[in-house]
């Protein structure tokens, strides 16, 4: 019997120092470019090799970025979010949400209090 896939969601504060070629990652998402259905959040789509984010090692492709230097990224147009990163200065603080896929036992053995669906 196949196991059910669940997700463990954690948050982390990541402080990056802008390198010679910038922060070194790509984003997708925004109110005009929803990457996840019914979610206009901003997601990391690419970590560039040898960039600041890659060298730090904590930011991962697929992470959702909740805020930049304390500024919430909710309900932003995609380009406005891009501009926010580009104008964020030398020291950049990111609040990110990691979503780790976990195998959670056989189907039909849902733990008590487990969210359905």
């Amino acid at each position: 019997m196949n196991g059910r896939v669940d997700y463990l969601v954690t948050e982390e504060e990541i402080n990056l120092t802008r390198g010679p070629s910038g922060l070194g990652f790509n984003i997708v998402g925004g109110t005009d470019q929803q990457y996840v259905s019914n979610d206009s959040g901003i997601y990391v789509s690419r970590i560039k090799e040898n960039g600041a984010a890659a060298l730090d090692g904590r930011l991962q492709e697929g992470d959702k970025i909740l805020s930049v230097n304390g500024q919430d990224l909710k309900n932003l147009l995609h380009q406005d979010a891009v501009d926010l990163f580009r104008n964020a200065g030398y020291a950049v603080s990111l609040r990110v949400q990691h979503r780790l896929q976990v195998q959670n036992g056989p189907i039909g053995h849902r733990g008590e209090g487990d969210p359905s669906g």
Partner: nanobody, 128 residues
Framework: QVQLVESGGGLVQAGGSLRLSCAAS????????MGWFRQRPGKERDVVAT????????YYLDSVKGRFTISRDNAKNTVFLQMNSLKPEDTAVYYC??????????????????????WGQGTQVTVS
């Protein structure tokens, strides 16, 4: 990590057609820019065609325009290269490549158009 597996290569006569496929796994396909590259005998690896993550922007090498078509099927996690009117000079190992799409948070000058992060093993195409 992204795993890429190409298929569809083979031996074909000049003027014939082949359809290459590249199946991707390891992360959501819908956020990936995809590309096809080729390495001809004794030559550097060249970009042949690319398609961005949303599917609304494509690029073709001049010598394949009008003959080759790149497309993607996000439901099947697959990118295709339809090759028509093949010529002997199309003989090469064809590689599928992928990278995360979207916008760089850095200045646009930093974008390297044909820099890809993940590569398949390649499939041989021989046109006789």
């Amino acid at each position: 990590q992204v795993q890429l597996v190409e298929s569809g290569g083979g031996l074909v006569q000049a003027g014939g057609s082949l359809r290459l496929s590249c199946a991707a796994s390891g992360r959501p396909f819908s956020s990936l820019d995809m590309g096809w590259f080729r390495q001809r005998p004794g030559k550097e690896r060249d970009v042949v065609a690319t398609i961005n993550w949303t599917g609304d922007s494509t690029y073709y090498l001049d010598s394949v325009k009008g003959r080759f078509t790149i497309s993607r099927d996000n439901a099947k996690n697959t990118v295709f290269l339809q090759m028509n009117s093949l010529k002997p000079e199309d003989t090469a190992v064809y590689y599928c490549a992928a990278r995360g799409g979207g916008s760089s948070v850095d200045s646009e000058y930093d974008v390297r158009e044909f820099e890809y992060d993940y590569w398949g093993q390649g499939t041989q195409v021989t046109v006789s």
